[in-house]
Amino acid sequence: LTCLGGFASPGPVPPSTALRELIEELVNITQNQKAPLCNGSMVWSINLTAGMYCAALESLINVSGCSAIEKTQRMLSGFCPHKVSAGQFSSLHVRDTKIEVAQFVKDLLLHLKKLFREGQFN
């Protein structure tokens, strides 16, 4: 999580701050959504459990050409300890269920807000 503040960061970003910033970005996406997010692209649904940050990134990284979620993809990479590339899938994906990116973001946002409220940052 130390790199989440970018090169200008004076030091490591506290996990709670990093999570709050990710939540705020997801809120921003949902509130500014006019046309269908990412042209209605579909992504694999994930289990919102341990390891979900990498799973979320693995799902979203397969969406290309969608500037609205690029910042989210970058932020999620800061929470995931390993490098994620397109086409990669973890056991956390619900491989028989695809949902729209907008719904994926909404579900992820709800879960992350509750993790923040409960003090679960990692």
Epitope: S16, L110, K113, F116, R117, G119
Partner: antibody, heavy 120, light 112 residues
Framework: EVQLVESGGGLVQPGGSLRLSCAAS????????IHWVRQAPGKGLEWVGR????????KYDPKFQGRFTISADNAKNSLYLQMNSLRAEDTAVYYC?????????????WGQGTLVTVSS | DIQMTQSPSSLSASVGDRVTITCRSS???????????LEWYQQKPGKAPKLLIY???NRFSGVPSRFSGSGSGTDFTLTISSLQPEDFATYYC?????????FGGGTKVEIK
Amino acid sequence: EVQLVESGGGLVQPGGSLRLSCAASGFNIKDTYIHWVRQAPGKGLEWVGRIDPANDNIKYDPKFQGRFTISADNAKNSLYLQMNSLRAEDTAVYYCARSEENWYDFFDYWGQGTLVTVSS
Amino acid sequence: DIQMTQSPSSLSASVGDRVTITCRSSQSIVHSNGNTYLEWYQQKPGKAPKLLIYKVSNRFSGVPSRFSGSGSGTDFTLTISSLQPEDFATYYCFQGSHIPYTFGGGTKVEIK
């Protein structure tokens, strides 16, 4: 319009059981936390516990753990408080309340309360 | 468990008076996410509580500006700058930072 409506209160004998309901409308219970709070006659407010209906994550005040059980039925958008081994000191008005939906910072809506009287 | 101690337990005041209610927690109620979930609720007889102040000093929407909250760490205050007839009620502080969440014992504000 957001609404919470409790029901199921009444007179019960010591040692008996009662199941309270909290019917929610105007929002999806999975989007927030629902709490149970009680108030004995002429006394202060007491937090009983809360549930996250999205994943059935439930927390109680330890004094109620074991005797009281909080649950949710997402299909019915309703919450429940199952109370067992009731004692006279459980006599109170029982409220359900929801955490506001943005950052869950506070209770923004409460039900009207339902009175539970434990007496022989 | 965190104890929330309110004082006074009751007070008599007149319309126009400045009223201060204090609440002390038995330990810090700063949450691990950095927020302090300290709220103030107003309750009138036979009614459900109503939120006045959240996160120590934030006034809830629709709450008159005469209500204000302050404090940090373990000591918190609710102030009513100029008491109005509709303010005669019981006031509770509440901490939602550490489970089990806890209410203060209440302060009943009565007409002098």
